[in-house]
Interface confidence: low
């Protein structure tokens, strides 16, 4: 006989990512005896909450909380019962709620209070429901990506922790209502609001981050729709042969389309809008989203926002990944270079509705919007953030790393549960439980 080492006890953490279009629940796990090790926290399971994001329940706050129940019931099953009381539970809301908080702060408070009431009914260690700032969303996405890819520290074969020489990855997140760019930079930011100083594992990181509200995929599509109604009476980014009834109240209810809102419009009026498959007009429409006219700093990305030159490799996730994956997988188009990405966007925008449906059978939802989405991603990366061909070569489009979704949720939990220490780890020996 020989002694058999028991596998270590696991700890769990739950994050509800309350995005603008939907809510996702992520359950993370890690060995209790290795809490400060890097790359040790992984995704245990996930659950997509049915229905829209919690911000869509502004008129029905209790509906927001009720929508979460299915996933919370799943969490009761996924986390061992004896671990329930010690499992932290967080809800973080992003740009959808930031927008609601701007237009109707009472409604956003009511939604959060309703959600809080429901979350406290569960046996987990509920630690709050709150709206993340754009900076948080960007930085926690960056932390997640670099934690999962073990860019902070790594355990070497000689039994020592060391900082890998490859440096950190930049992170680009394209949500439904905002987009974030975050990367390590050597020089101080000219706009201090865009700089975050981090101390992780005894290393100091100076990080540039900026979140562009209203530049998430869904809000961009709404803004393009408003522009198309305003300037063309048809939609150059939609495929020819595609037509739909547009409810004006839906188009203009967002603060993101406020600037395009006609002075006197009937919110219950419906307008018929048709696509024209015009890549050049579509490109012009998308270009109108970016302003390069004034910059109060030595250099800017767009809209007068300071940004140092993009440096190093980047991981682009969420809708960046979905858009590029559609071009690559569904359309079979190469997207390895910026030129190819632009050509792919033009290709999609040239397709008629019939051609698009034949090429991508069974994917009706949002199919008409992929031209605008692809054109926007291409313009945001090249003109907006200033990626040239060389820099673009260092961008990987990824949904997961180490079987864990890349997004702000893991980084948020790591921070709030102090799973990334500021101090460097001592000389520790690893224990293999395999």
């Amino acid at each position: 006989t020989r002694d058999v080492r028991e596998p270590p006890a696991l700890k769990y953490g739950i994050v509800l990512d309350a995005g603008s279009s939907h809510t996702s629940m992520f359950i993370y796990k890690w060995p209790a005896d290795k809490e400060n090790d890097t790359g040790i926290v992984g995704q245990h399971s996930s659950c997509d909450v049915p229905g829209g994001g919690i911000s869509s329940y502004a008129d029905n706050p209790s509906g927001a909380s009720q929508s979460l129940v299915g996933c919370l019931e799943q969490a009761l099953q996924d986390v061992p019962k004896e671990r329930h009381a010690g499992t932290p539970l967080y809800l973080g809301a992003t740009a959808g709620m930031r927008l609601l908080n701007l237009t109707n702060p009472e409604a956003s408070t009511s939604v959060l209070m309703a959600v809080t009431h429901t979350l406290t009914q569960y046996p987990f260690d509920f630690r709050g429901a709150r709206i993340l700032s754009g900076q948080e969303e960007g930085v926690f996405g960056w932390v997640t990506a670099n934690y999962l890819l073990e860019n902070f520290i790594k355990y070497g074969w000689v039994g020592r922790w060391f900082r890998p020489r490859k440096g950190t990855l930049g992170a680009m997140d394209l949500g439904g209502a905002s987009t974030q760019i975050t990367f390590e930079t050597t020089s101080p930011a000219e706009d201090r609001a865009s700089e975050v100083q981090l101390h992780l594992y005894g290393q100091h990181y100076r990080v540039y981050t900026h979140s562009f509200l209203c530049y998430g995929r869904d809000q961009v599509l709404q803004r393009l729709l408003a522009s198309a109604l305003q300037t063309h009476g048809f939609h150059p980014c939609w495929p020819r042969g595609f037509s739909t009834q547009v409810l004006l109240g839906d188009v203009y209810q967002s603060p993101c389309t406020m600037a395009q809102r006609p002075q006197n419009f009937n919110s219950s009026a419906r307008v018929s809008l048709s696509g024209s498959s015009d890549p050049h007009l579509c490109r012009d429409l998308v270009s109108g989203l970016f302003s390069f006219s004034s910059c109060p700093f030595s250099r800017c990305s767009f809209n007068g926002v300071f940004q140092p030159p993009v440096a190093g490799n980047f991981v682009a996730f969420s809708a960046f990944f979905y858009t590029v994956d559609f071009l690559r997988t569904s359309m079979g188009l190469p997207v390895a270079t910026l030129q190819q990405l632009e050509a792919a966007a033009v290709n999609v925008c040239n397709q008629t509705w019939a051609q698009l449906q034949a090429r991508v059978p069974g994917q009706r939802a949002r199919l008409a919007d992929y031209c605008a989405g692809a054109m926007f991603v291409q313009q945001l990366l090249s003109r907006g953030y200033g990626f040239d061909e060389r820099a673009f070569g260092g961008v990987i489009f990824q949904k997961k790393a180490a079987d864990t979704a890349v997004g702000w949720a893991l980084g948020y939990m790591l921070n709030l549960t102090n799973l990334i220490p500021a101090d460097p780890p001592g000389l520790r020996k690893g224990t293999d439980f395999s």
């Epitope: 701007l102 948080e136 969303e137 975050v196």
Partner: antibody, heavy 125, light 106 residues
Amino acid sequence: QVQLVQSGAEVVKPGASVKISCKASGYTFTDYNMDWVKQAPGQRLEWIGDINPKYDISTYNQQFKGKATITVDKSASTAYMELSSLRSEDTAVYYCARRGFFLYYGINYYYFDVWGQGTLVTVSS
Amino acid sequence: EIVLTQSPATLSASPGEEITLSCSASSSVSYIHWYQQKPGQAPRLLIYSTSNLASGIPARFSGSGSGTFYTLTISSVEPEDAAVYYCHQWSSYPWTFGGGTKLEIK
């Protein structure tokens, strides 16, 4: 330098209203939220509410909803707080405070970095 | 709402002495700020985000803590430190303050 100058002391009768002001200087008024805090004699400080001058959006502590109304005049870089239906328990020093923030680890940590000198409101018949 | 309880309510110290003021939260908070208020004056920011010294505050002041328990330490008390010290949480709405600790100098 950054300064918040509040209006002078007020003595008001029960049931009346009072509007106190807080003039900001030395910084861009619309870049920071302005909060109001109550300090009643022998009591702890209580947060009343705040206003975002850029968007004219105010948020209140539930306890002060209906009691306090916070507004701004952007052109005058001035925040106001009106207290209505005054009672003896509203007797207190009221402070305006600028909501500063410190960005660390991606989180905006808010705090009150500059305070007005305070306005004493006495409710007495 | 989160209730912050400060102890002791009053503290008497001699110049040069090291003292510690505590602030206990009714449930976990992410960070705490500390303010100093002298008689007839408005509160003044002392320490923000648990341990960061505000501009112009002497290095003898320091803060630490996490979760539900936070402390403010004055390493060598000076006569001008006589004041009421308040802790303040901004983790959970509505934002709340502690009841204060009054520091008297012997």
